[in-house]
Interface confidence: low
């Protein structure tokens, strides 16, 4: 009786089980009673990542620099190209089909975590004793200047956006 199901890495065609093509190869012709499945390797810039019966290999993904993408891992005959974002950008989705600019942290906020290819900049408010006076995707909050260590006194208090202003101590005559 003809089989109704085939083993792993086989497929059912014309009431018989044929071997699937291995990853990196495409199907040229199905097996027959007398011949094995015929497979051919994928061409350059093509891939198939599973045991398959595909007659065409898939094109490697193109990491479009106009979308801010670059190659993170070059594709092989068995794997697709993996794209990531250029420096200063991060992916808009897990598939990384396009990128957006990393967020800058505004004055009064510092960078808690620098952006990566997949996550945006994480900003944090500068706590008391710290400040940031720039909009930056790199800069952390800076500590206020310690006037005392310079033998000076605070003339103007610092804020989350400005450093303290130090000045000379009043001398008793």
């Amino acid at each position: 009786e003809p089989p109704t199901a085939c083993r792993e890495k086989q497929y059912l065609i014309n009431s018989q089980c044929c071997s699937l093509c291995q990853p990196g190869q495409k199907l040229v012709s199905d097996c027959t009673e007398f011949t094995e499945t015929e497979c051919l390797p994928c061409g350059e810039s093509e891939f198939l990542d599973t045991w398959n019966r595909e007659t065409h290999c898939h094109q490697h993904k193109y990491c479009d620099p106009n979308l801010g993408l670059r190659v993170q891992q070059k594709g092989t005959s068995e794997t697709d190209t993996i794209c990531t974002c250029e420096e200063g950008w991060h992916c808009t989705s897990e598939a990384c089909e396009s990128c957006v600019l990393h967020r800058s942290c505004s004055p009064g906020f510092g960078v808690k975590q620098i952006a990566t290819g997949v996550s945006d900049t994480i900003c944090e408010p500068c706590p008391v004793g710290f400040f940031s006076n720039v909009s930056s995707a790199f800069e952390k909050c800076h500590p206020w200047t310690s006037c005392e260590t310079k033998d000076l006194v605070v003339q103007q208090a610092g804020t989350n956006k400005t450093d303290v202003v130090c000045g000379p101590q009043d001398r008793l005559r």
Epitope: R70, E87, G88, L101, S135
Partner: antibody, heavy 119, light 112 residues
């Protein structure tokens, strides 16, 4: 190929304003920050600021803040730099320059626009 | 602001000889991501600057391999291994790690 084409030379009176344009082609305009750099006659280069054309976010050199306004028109792939309250020391060549992504450097430059401020 | 100081201000070198231009930064240009945000540009009279070297050592597209960048932290060098007539220009270093981005004052390179 990437091209940045700037508007022509301008002669302006002190106290007036000027708006210089920079038309981009050969790449996705919204994908790259546009920078502006000033070069006074016989002098070096000064970075004025930049704009992200996608969001319209700007970063200014403090020296040019209040003096300079950067804008971008996504529909025409054109960046603009407006200088107000012109003085004779604003006489300079103004360049637009694209910020390369992975490079984080100014990879392509416009041909420059000479702005002359004279009464 | 970060100050970039180039030396010398001008330089005359014979054709085929090595030319070296230095750039010193008032603070480190090395980011925590290990990149050094120091770049070099060439400007010929009446033309816009052209990017030569980005992020310390990387040659931009189409730049001849006689141009190379080196250095670390705060001290950087642009080297032209064998000077050609077309290399006569003003050369600028630039940093893009801290806003405002700044340029060196320029070094004028001439043929001896």
């Amino acid at each position: 190929q990437v091209q940045l084409v700037q508007s022509g030379a301008e002669v302006k009176k002190p106290g007036s304003s000027v708006k210089v344009s920079c038309k981009a082609s050969g790449y996705t305009f919204t994908g790259y920050n546009m920078n502006w750099v000033r070069q006074a006659p016989g002098q070096g280069l000064e970075w004025m600021g930049n704009i992200d054309p996608y969001y319209g976010n700007t970063n200014y050199n403090q020296k040019f803040k209040g003096k300079t306004t950067l804008t971008a028109d996504k529909s025409t792939s054109t960046a603009y730099m407006e200088l107000s309250s012109l003085r004779s020391d604003d006489t300079a060549v103004y360049y637009c320059a694209r910020l390369g992504l992975q490079l984080y450097a100014l990879d392509y430059w416009g041909q420059g626009t000479l702005v002359t401020v004279s009464s | 602001d970060i100050v970039l100081t180039q030396s010398p201000d001008s330089l005359a070198v014979s054709l085929g000889e090595r030319a070296t231009i230095n750039c010193r930064a008032s603070q480190s240009l090395v980011h925590s991501n290990a990149n050094t945000y120091l770049h070099w540009y060439q400007q010929k009279p009446g033309q816009p600057p052209k990017l030569l070297i980005y992020k310390l050592t990387n040659r931009f597209f189409g730049v001849p391999d006689r141009f190379s960048g080196s250095g670390s932290g705060t001290d950087f060098t642009l080297t032209i291994s064998s000077l050609q007539a077309e290399d006569v220009a003003v050369y600028y270093c630039q940093q893009s790690i801290h806003v405002p981005w700044t340029f060196g004052q320029g070094t004028k390179l001439e043929i001896k």
